[in-house]
Interface confidence: low
């Protein structure tokens, strides 16, 4: 029967006794930077070309004996997971291996850099179709390794990496912390995060998604027909590299941003038991398990968005946190979150010719997060319209005054330390077309976009008494672009998007007490692009 | 605490010293920074990636590497250029004493220097 991991990533319509998805990634070349491999294994024979690249450190210890099968173990298994005949994800993908890890599975940042440079030069000398680079390795945070990954990604290469097996924040490791890399955590057959001895999968905001990574059957280097079960975030990353190869084979023109958004979109949502993660990391860690799309046809009609969390601002009074979208994504909205509830809101601002989302800590606060909603919106023209705090008692308003521009998100930022104590009137972001409305002492920022066929609507869900969490979701066919909270009273910790749901978090009800001012409303802005839908229909 | 770019994990040292007559000060008076792995057992001191500013050409990278070697030799230090990077990042990989970091950070075109460190199969 089909191994659990292949079943897990396969949409129901493809499930049969055998895993046989259409089109096996044959247009794509996958580079593997790992140990040496046994290229003659039946799973990968004829599918993997061993390059002459080798840059590894000496093995530790004078008594270490090189044993070929052990030296090849990690890389052979991963090559099999990506493209193996029977146990592989993308059975049609061709692979090239570079040796950057020694027989003990150890390498160096410099060796990995030189390997990435080798790939770039190969790409320049002999341009081929889409390239996927699998980096099933991790070291401490490295500015230079992250920078090299960024450059290669900007050259059109898709990089997939292991989140790391340290049961820790993936942002402390490289290349896992590189924003341009697709970082993959590991889950098991029960959709639990993988435990590895006393450690386990990494987690946090630098993880893009999870994939099967425990008890994965694949090629063993012990013999050319041997199989073995291995576990780790490397195995998880290999699944995603295979899925990426499949997607790119179906749609070779996909950009990295488009691919990442599709990986997120087609993932299984909210299936991971988050209790395994440290409490402060749960909100930051994506509850997504990778899966193949239900069809090889693209989903070009879909408006894709994802949530990007910033690093924590730190606790100083004027501390800020910044969340950024990828170069070819549009920032459609910006929100903020603070566990202490002490924050001064957020704003969208231009930085280096691109909009970023900046959240502001407040006096006595433990720090804030900025949360960007990053979307794929072709031919978009987006801008931010700001209204300073209003002198009138009613509140501050700002709208999208340009014809054809629609409101995709509202942010508010205030200088007063605790807006909540003022108990002001706070108005809903409706009324005049394309309008954000807010507290009279806050500046209001409207994200206004014009794009072919873009249409948006608002959905609100209000709860009259304080609740720790209020949510509102966009309907099928609509994508959440904006998420904010009304009113801005002191017990609201912030708002953020989880998949297509807007979540507004408040302080523990028991500590705030239930007052008439305690009402909390979650406001979602839901958009869709009829232009993308039309274009997709015309292609088919 | 973490800054907005997520670099809080590294130890960032901005090494300044008296003007070294043999080294040109970096352009615009900016000081290049030194980075090393926050996890001590994974550090590989003695090998450094010298990263040059983005638009630096290969010939400038090679010239900067040679200049470092020459200036180090005048001080009685042996250095070895292990690799010159181009195509992704401009720069070079050098085996040298940590004593030379102050000197290297003042070389023209230098953006930052990172001490090599280990990576592991996951």
């Amino acid at each position: 029967s089909i191994p659990w991991n292949l079943e897990r990533i396969t949409p129901p319509r493809y499930r049969a006794d055998e895993y046989q998805p259409p089109d096996g990634g044959s247009l794509v070349e996958v580079y593997l930077l790992d140990t040496s491999i046994q290229s003659g294994h039946r799973e990968i024979e004829g599918r993997v070309m061993v390059t002459d690249f080798e840059n590894v450190p000496e093995e530790d210890g004078t008594r270490f004996h090189r044993q070929a099968s052990k030296c090849d173990s990690h890389g052979t298994h991963l090559a099999g997971v990506v493209s193996g005949r029977d146990a592989g994800v993308a059975k049609g993908a061709s692979m090239r291996s570079l040796r950057v890890l020694n027989c003990q599975g150890k390498g160096t940042v410099s060796g990995t850099l030189i390997g990435l440079e080798f790939i770039r030069k190969s790409q320049l000398v002999q341009p081929v179709g889409p390239l996927v680079v699998l980096l099933p390795l991790a070291g401490g945070y490295s500015r230079v390794l992250n920078a090299a990954c960024q450059r290669l990604a900007r050259a059109g290469v898709v990089l997939v990496t292991a989140a790391g097996n340290f049961r820790d924040d993936a942002c402390l490791y490289s290349p896992a912390s590189a924003p341009e890399v697709i970082t993959v955590g590991a889950t098991n057959a029960q959709d639990q995060p993988v435990t590895l001895g006393t450690l386990g999968t990494n987690f946090g905001r630098c993880v893009d998604l999870f994939a099967p990574g425990e008890d994965i059957i694949g090629a063993s280097s012990d013999c050319s027909t041997c199989y073995v079960s291995q576990s780790g975030t490397s195995q998880a990353a290999a699944h995603v590299a295979g899925i990426a190869a499949m997607m790119l084979s179906a749609e070779p023109e996909l950009t990295l941003a488009e691919l990442r958004q599709r990986l997120i979109h087609f993932s299984a949502k909210d299936v991971i038991n988050e209790a395994w993660f440290p409490e402060d990391q749960r909100v930051l860690t994506p509850n997504l398990v990778a899966a193949l799309p239900p069809s090889t046809h693209g989903a070009g009609w879909q408006l894709f968005c994802r949530t990007v969390w910033s690093a924590h601002s730190g606790p100083t009074r004027m501390a800020t946190a910044v969340a950024r979208c990828a170069p070819d994504e549009e920032l459609l909205s910006c929100s903020s979150f603070s566990r202490s509830g002490k924050r001064r809101g957020e704003r969208m601002e231009a930085q280096g010719g691109k909009l970023v989302c900046r959240a502001h800590n407040a006096f006595g606060g433990e720090g804030v997060y900025a949360i960007a909603r990053c979307c794929l919106l072709p031919q978009a023209n987006c801008s931010v319209h700001t209204a300073p705090p209003a002198e009138a008692s009613m509140g501050t308003r700002v709208h999208c005054h340009q014809q054809g521009h629609v409101l995709t998100g509202c942010s508010s930022h205030w200088e007063v330390e605790d807006l909540g104590t003022h108990k002001p009137p706070v108005l809903r972001p409706r009324g005049q077309p394309n309008q954000c409305v807010g507290h009279r002492e806050a500046s209001i920022h409207a994200s206004c976009c014009h794009a072919p066929g873009l249409e948006c609507k608002v959905k609100e869900h209000g709860i009259p008494a304080p609740q720790e969490q209020v949510t509102v979701a966009c309907e099928e066919g609509w994508t959440l672009t904006g998420c904010s909270a009304l009113p801005g009273t002191s017990h609201v910790l912030g708002a953020y998007a989880v998949d297509n749901t807007c979540v507004v978090r408040s302080r523990d009800v028991s500590t705030t007490g239930s007052t008439s001012e305690g009402a909390v409303t979650a406001v979602a802005i839901c958009c869709r692009s009829r232009h993308l839908a039309q274009a997709s229909q015309e292609l088919q | 605490q973490e800054d907005e770019d997520g670099d809080y994990e590294e130890l960032v040292l901005a090494l300044r010293s008296e003007e070294d007559g043999l080294a040109e000060a970096p352009e615009h008076g900016t000081t290049a920074t030194f980075h090393r792995c926050a996890k001590d057992p994974w550090r590989l001191p003695g090998t450094y990636v010298v990263v040059l500013k983005e638009e630096t050409h290969l010939s400038q990278s090679e010239r900067t590497a040679r200049r470092l070697q020459a200036q180090a030799a005048r001080r009685g230090y042996l250095t070895k250029i292990l690799h010159v990077f181009h195509g992704l990042l401009p720069g070079f990989l050098v085996k040298m004493s940590g004593d030379l970091l102050e000197l290297a950070l003042k070389l023209p075109h230098v953006d930052y220097i990172e001490e090599d460190s280990s990576v592991f199969a996951q």
Partner: antibody
């Protein structure tokens, strides 16, 4: 629950005037534009004008400029329509409607029950 | 000024029938077209906004399509409660005003 309740209709002499009221409840009155629409007996719907209760800004159908005046009292959550120089052809049911904003589109999403104005001697 | 022309002005149909009403604008109104339903003695009720977006609570048998100048309201399977008058409405940019179609009365055959 959003509710709009009109009042002030009735029999009016030709040349006379009247003021219709529309009391809103169940939402933040100042956050939504409000419209007046009328419907003569057996006829279709005809837009009179609208107001932004937040700032009092108004727009009118050319046909009603000088004849209709729309105002509001935010403290009472109430919308008004003042009609002058009434004639027999102004006989109609007058509706107030809230202008719901569906980000990127607009629609009159809640309507009052209507109040009948009859102009006759 | 924009004129909105609805056709037919009335139609007779039976329960279960598929009914199509058209609305034509004298100039391009983009997607800013709304459909309302009105029953005798009652206020109009919002059905569809932005040409094709179904207002929440409206049965899915109602659908709207079109953009620019030609729009359609379709009732896929007419129900007894659907016998009413249907109005289209557009926004006139030049006047900053709102224009209704003449209405289509759907009667029992």
């Amino acid at each position: 629950e959003v509710q709009l309740l009109e009042s002030g209709g009735g029999l009016v002499q030709p040349g006379g005037s009247l003021r219709l009221s529309c009391k809103a409840s169940g939402y933040t009155f100042s956050s939504y534009w409000m419209h007046w629409v009328r419907q003569a007996p057996g006829k279709g719907l005809e837009w009179i004008g609208r107001i932004d209760p937040y700032n009092g800004g108004t727009k009118y159908n050319e046909k009603f400029k000088g004849k209709a005046t729309i105002s509001r009292d935010n403290s009472k959550n109430t919308l008004y329509l003042q009609m002058n120089s009434l004639r027999a052809e102004d006989t109609a049911v007058y509706y107030c409607a809230r202008y719901g904003y569906y980000l990127g589109s607009y629609a009159m999403d809640y309507w009052g029950q209507g109040t009948l104005v009859t102009v006759s001697s | 000024d924009i004129q909105m022309t609805q056709s037919p002005s009335s139609l007779s149909a039976s329960v279960g029938d598929r009914v199509t009403i058209t609305c034509r604008a004298s100039q391009d109104v983009s997607r800013y077209l709304t459909w309302y339903q009105q029953k005798p003695g009652k206020a109009p009720k919002l059905l569809i906004y932005a040409a094709s977006s179904l207002q929440s609570g409206v049965p899915s048998r109602f659908s709207g399509s079109g953009s620019g100048t030609d729009f359609t309201l379709t009732i896929s399977s007419l129900q007894p409660e659907d016998f009413a008058t249907y109005y289209c409405q557009a926004y006139d940019y030049s006047l900053s005003g709102y224009v209704f179609g003449g209405g289509t009365k759907v009667e029992i055959k």
